[in-house]
Interface confidence: low
């Protein structure tokens, strides 16, 4: 049977039994081999107990005495089989053996769970020689036990290539429950069930679990570890923890926050990065994500003109990189812009609206009724037109650009003239005689150059020909009017 000792038991006497005189005080060891020193253990367990020698793993010496009597089998004395103690306490345990003096160089090694204990362990071997035998006592001490010290300890001795092994000494370190799995923070959907897991171990077992929500116990009766708490759903943020209980006391897990996923806060810092006539580049800083990643964003644009009845334009874009170029806008217009972003729960409110303006645009219409005729007396070409019906958004007219192309005998030459905004006529010098002159006119604003009018062609004859009639912008359908004068 396994002998068990609890830490509150009285220590055994140091050397009970079978040595003659029980090793009186004047019988000091000849040799002491300490691996560590200076430790007074809180618990000490003796090497032997009354009873028969251990016969499990023995060495039968072949040497006989003068009287030819066989020596008794060599075996470690029985010792305490099971030591139970609390974490951080000290413990000392021994194994002992009596070895006939005919054997030399006997050493004892300590093993734990099948592995030899080497290095800086607190092991001491003491030798007590007598006339025929030497009592060897191997002590092993641990100053402050930890859970990792749990296990089965044995002594081994080699004699004549035979290995003698002691009975195991089982060390059981008990303490407060130790968590192997604690609940984790989560972001959950409102009123949707979710699970939390808590697992703790001893020894001592069993370990029982209580769940705590916002400082109040959830379950009246404990659950054996591991425990899974199914929460049917929350409507607001809560903090959960679990308590692990065993005979040694209570350990409380970390408190974890369970957040309720919500619609995001609206974006902030909507800023205008760049403006053109028909586009606005905006950026924004996303608001709080509502414990759920952003999916995409929506840019809402409406004309800020109070007289405008234009509907809101919506542009959808990805959540990153918090930048969007709004296109298809009118030139020289004011817009109110707001940004909203969504997560899996829904759309945020729109950000505070900001005012943004597009710049002037180029004219969208060409000058009308372009007429060209030759003034032979001054050797000029006169050009007349009507001002285009420019929209307000096109900006203020600053002038016109006239393109005139001269073609003669395979030679082509284009010239450009800029004309101020006040006039609706221009005069250009004849560049080449016996040639065709093609004229186009475009209106110009600060926003750029508008479309050119349809081409009007006029033939410039050699000197001496008569200027009969003008050439003008054709009616629709006449693609290539040429007037020969």
């Amino acid at each position: 049977a396994i002998t068990e000792a609890r830490e509150e038991a009285k220590p055994y006497p140091l050397f009970p039994g079978p040595f003659p005189g029980s090793l009186q005080t004047d019988h000091t060891p000849l040799l002491s081999l300490p691996h560590a020193s200076g430790y007074q253990p809180a618990l000490m367990f003796s090497p032997t107990q009354p009873g028969r020698p251990h016969t499990g793993n023995v060495a039968i010496p072949q040497v006989t005495s003068v009287e030819s009597k066989p020596l008794p089998p060599l075996a470690f004395k029985h010792t305490v089989g099971h030591i139970i103690l609390s974490e951080h306490k000290g413990v000392k345990f021994n194994c002992s053996i009596s070895v006939p003096n005919i054997y030399q160089d006997t050493t004892i090694s300590w093993w734990k769970d099948g592995k030899e204990l080497l290095g800086a362990h607190h092991a001491i071997t003491q030798f007590y020689p007598d006339d025929e035998v030497t009592a060897i006592i191997a002590s092993f001490s641990i100053t402050s036990v930890q859970r990792s010290d749990n296990g089965s300890y044995i002594c081994k001795m080699k004699i004549n290539n035979e290995e003698i092994v002691s009975d195991p000494i089982y060390i059981e370190v008990q303490g407060l429950p130790h968590f192997t799995k604690q609940p984790e923070s989560m972001n959950v959907t409102r009123n949707t069930a979710f699970n939390l897991t808590c697992q703790a171990v001893g020894p001592p077992e069993p370990v029982n679990i209580f769940w705590v929500q916002n400082s109040s116990r959830v379950n009246e009766q404990p659950e054996k570890s591991p425990s899974v708490l199914t929460v049917p759903g929350l409507t607001e943020m809560a903090v959960f923890s679990c308590e692990a209980h065993n005979d040694k006391g209570l350990t409380v897990s970390k408190g974890v926050q369970i957040n309720i996923k919500a619609i995001p806060s609206p974006p902030t810092e909507v800023s205008i990065r760049n403006s053109t006539a028909h586009s606005i580049l905006i950026s924004w800083v996303p608001g709080f994500d509502g414990y759920s990643p952003f999916r995409n964003c929506s840019i809402q644009v409406k004309e800020a003109d109070p007289l405008s009845n234009g509907s809101v334009m919506i542009f959808n874009t990805s959540a990153l990189p918090h930048l969007y170029q709004i296109k298809q806008l009118q030139a020289l217009a004011n817009y109110s812009i707001g940004v909203s972003c969504m997560n899996e729960i829904g759309w945020s409110a729109v950000s505070p609206w900001i005012l943004a303006s597009t710049t002037e645009g180029a004219p969208s219409v060409a000058p009308l009724n372009v007429t060209v005729f030759l003034n032979e007396s001054s050797d000029n070409v006169d050009i007349r037109w009507m001002k285009p019906p420019t929209k307000q958004q096109d900006g203020e007219l600053v002038g016109y650009r006239i393109s005139h192309v001269w073609q003669s005998a395979g030679i082509s030459k284009e010239l450009l003239e800029e004309v101020g905004q006040n006039g609706s006529r221009a005069r250009i010098s004849v560049q080449v005689h016996n040639a065709t002159c093609t004229v186009r006119i475009a209106a110009v604003t600060r926003g750029g150059v508008g479309p050119f009018s349809d081409p009007v062609k006029i033939f410039i004859p050699a000197h001496g020909w008569v200027d009969y009639a003008p050439s003008s912008t054709p009616a629709p359908g006449n693609a290539d009017p040429v007037l020969i004068i």
Epitope: S265, P266, T268, E269, S271, R273, N274, L281, S283, V285, G287, F288, L320, P321, L323, Q325, A349, P352
Partner: antibody, heavy 116, light 111 residues
């Protein structure tokens, strides 16, 4: 690990220009703005402006409009700040910082000294 | 521009005691439940280091003895207990709108 590597100190003459690189690594360069901050000796910090590498959009503090120009080279994950028409007032340490909620990542700073 | 007024300009605190630095914004830097105020620590020859973002969120890797709070447009950085390595200059900064601005700084000395 996010890293912003700036170049060494620069000594430039008044009226000249200087271009400071900031090479980013450890994150997707185009996902974050790059902000620039000035610190004159013994003084506080001044935000210069930032650039979004994705499309090159920039914004500047009014004080630095016309003084600083921010650009990026996405192929090398490098942001640049050019300072022009330098005067002694521009002598300072210039930092690049990755734009986010607060500037969690900074370059080590480039000291620009303007001296004849 | 939003002006950030930081006080005091310098502060001497005994080891283990509490250091309190204030930053007042000339107008709100808060919206939608978030305050766009951040705190930095800067030591000589080094770039600033983000300590607190969005008024009260501790940046990853920053010791828990640093904390931030807000009351209206007043923001506070607390360091408790102060350690020797906390000797530095501290700045507040907002990112509510462009341009971002910084406070003038508070130099903390440990005695």
């Amino acid at each position: 690990e996010v890293q912003l590597q700036q170049s060494g100190p620069e000594l430039v003459k008044p009226g000249a220009s200087v271009r400071i690189p900031c090479k980013a690594s450890g994150y997707t360069f185009s996902d974050y703005n790059m902000d620039w901050v000035k610190q004159s000796h013994g003084k506080s910090l001044e935000w210069i402006g930032n650039i979004n590498p994705n499309i090159g959009g920039t914004i500047y503090s009014q004080k630095f409009k016309g003084k600083a120009t921010l650009t990026v080279d996405k192929s090398s994950s490098t942001a640049y700040m050019e300072l022009r028409s330098l005067t002694s007032e521009d002598t300072a340490v210039y930092y690049c910082a990755r734009g986010d909620y607060g500037f969690a990542s900074w370059g080590q700073g480039t000291l620009v000294t303007v001296s004849a | 521009d939003i002006v950030l007024t930081q006080s005091p300009a310098s502060l001497t605190v005994s080891l283990g005691q509490r250091a309190t630095i204030s930053c007042r914004a000339s107008r709100s830097v808060s919206t939608s439940g978030y305050s766009y105020m951040h705190w930095y620590q800067q030591k000589p020859g080094q770039p600033p280091k983000l300590l607190i973002y969005l008024a009260s969120n501790l940046e990853s890797g920053v010791p828990a003895r640093f904390s931030g709070s807000r009351s209206g447009t007043d923001f506070t950085l607390n360091i408790h207990p102060v350690e020797e390595e906390d000797a530095a200059t501290y700045y507040c900064q907002h990112s509510r709108e462009y341009p971002f601005t910084f406070g003038s700084g508070t130099k903390l000395e440990i005695k």
